[in-house]
């Protein structure tokens, strides 16, 4: 049960993924691929980093716009189309034997509504965090990182809602 992220056609999609470099600045290779995480590496790689920087992108629409050097390897897909829908794998290749962190997230791309009424704050927040706001539940344990956002305070929600609105994305747990 992957966490689902929703974006409208033509907008940017934001798929969160992060790790804590230990020690700080000690970066590890990361890959993003289309399709659930396989046994090793990523299938259908769309973006790959090494210990220093992004070293492989299959398209100019894929970006790491967060603070990569602090472990924010969230993927931004610009100008999404319906074909971008599907499961994506974020794999953090922590050195060691079968030590990788694997995160599967699901992107749902929808056609924009014909008429979009000005959203109220409540509607915006509910679309961004439906389960969190209505039930207080978190997503399933295996999708806590990077997908769901436990213990979010109001300031964080305002910030996150603005980020999501900027990217054209909303979030829901599957």
């Amino acid at each position: 049960s992957e966490v689902e992220y929703i974006a409208e056609v033509g907008q940017n999609a934001y798929l969160p993924c992060s790790y804590t470099p230990a020690p700080p600045g000690n970066l590890v290779p990361v890959c993003w691929g289309k399709g659930a995480c396989p046994v090793f590496d990523c299938s259908n790689v769309v973006l790959r980093t090494d210990n220093r920087d992004v070293n492989d992108r299959t398209s100019g629409r894929y970006w790491l716009k967060g603070d990569f050097h602090k472990g924010d390897v969230s993927l931004t897909i610009e100008n999404v189309t319906l074909a971008d829908s599907g499961v994506y794998c974020c794999r953090i290749q922590i050195p060691g034997i079968m030590n990788d962190e694997k995160h599967n997230v699901k992107l749902v791309v929808i056609k924009p509504a014909k008429v979009t009424p000005a959203p109220t704050l409540q509607r915006d927040l509910t679309s961004a965090f439906p389960r969190m706001l209505t039930t207080g539940e978190h997503g399933p344990a295996e999708t806590q990182t990077p997908g769901s956002l436990p213990d979010v305070n109001l300031t964080q929600i305002f910030t996150l809602t603005n980020e999501l609105r900027d990217s054209g994305a909303t979030i829901r747990t599957a």
Epitope: P29, G33, V39, D41, S43, P95, M98
Partner: antibody
Framework: EVQLVESGGGLVQPRGSLRLSCAAS????????MSWVRQAPGKGLEWVSA????????YYADSVKGRFTISRDNSKNTLYLQMNSLRAEDTAVYYC?????????????WGQGTLVTVSS | EIVLTQSPGTLSLSPGERATLSCRAS??????LAWYQQKPGQAPRLLIY???SRATGIPDRFSGSGSGTDFTLTISRLEPEDFAVYYC?????????FGGGTKVEIK
């Protein structure tokens, strides 16, 4: 043209050690995960181990975990398999295999194989 | 681990005939399945990956289908060079596993 050439096989006694090498050419070696796959005489294929392009992440079948160590030297375009505590059931042809394009966990190129025989 | 069961174990056919090989997984592997051909004394050769994508240089008489647990490799018209052993391999769940193989022999 992609080429994978294994070496280092031979006859070894039980509980002995052997180191296999695989020299790669014709592709950007450091960009691809690599694997070792073996085939006992007259039997099917068995995946043994894999290593990420950077060499930092390694993966093993339960049958060899703790006894075999996979490694790579990207400056030499070479893959290695250090095999310790060998058993009779490790007797097989060992193939070096390149991971598929875009990270696929299938094998689009294989070496010719090197035979490892464990016997007293 | 995921067990791949290939059937039949041996397929006896004549050149020009159609061959249908089956691979069944003990649990879903999505579309993470590959097919290989192996001839005596040679290394395996990749035919199909991601269940239905043909590898570079593979003739279009080879096709793959299926998802989840049931997969099929079809050779539309057998050529003399197609008589060999065929293996399926899954990469959806650790460890990677191969099927036991199907031998396609000349009738």
């Amino acid at each position: 043209e992609v080429q994978l050439v294994e070496s280092g096989g031979g006859l070894v006694q039980p509980r002995g050690s052997l180191r296999l090498s695989c020299a790669a050419s014709g592709f950007t070696f450091s960009s691809y995960a690599m694997s070792w796959v073996r085939q006992a005489p007259g039997k099917g294929l068995e995946w043994v181990s894999a290593i990420s392009g950077s060499g930092g992440s390694t993966y093993y079948a339960d049958s060899v975990k703790g006894r075999f160590t996979i490694s790579r030297d990207n400056s030499k375009n070479t893959l290695y398999l250090q095999m310790n505590s060998l058993r009779a059931e490790d007797t097989a042809v060992y193939y070096c295999a390149k991971g598929g394009d875009y990270g696929g966990n299938y094998f689009d190129y294989w070496g010719q194989g090197t035979l490892v025989t464990v016997s007293s | 681990e995921i067990v791949l069961t290939q059937s039949p174990g041996t397929l006896s056919l004549s050149p020009g005939e159609r061959a249908t090989l089956s691979c069944r997984a003990s649990q879903s592997v999505s579309s993470y399945l590959a097919w290989y051909q192996q001839k005596p004394g040679q290394a395996p050769r990749l035919l199909i990956y991601d269940a239905s994508s043909r590898a570079t240089g593979i003739p279009d008489r080879f096709s793959g289908s299926g998802s989840g647990t049931d997969f099929t490799l079809t050779i539309s018209r057998l050529e003399p060079e197609d008589f060999a052993v065929y293996y399926c391999q899954q990469y959806g769940s650790s460890p990677l596993t191969f099927g036991g193989g199907t031998k396609v022999e000349i009738k």
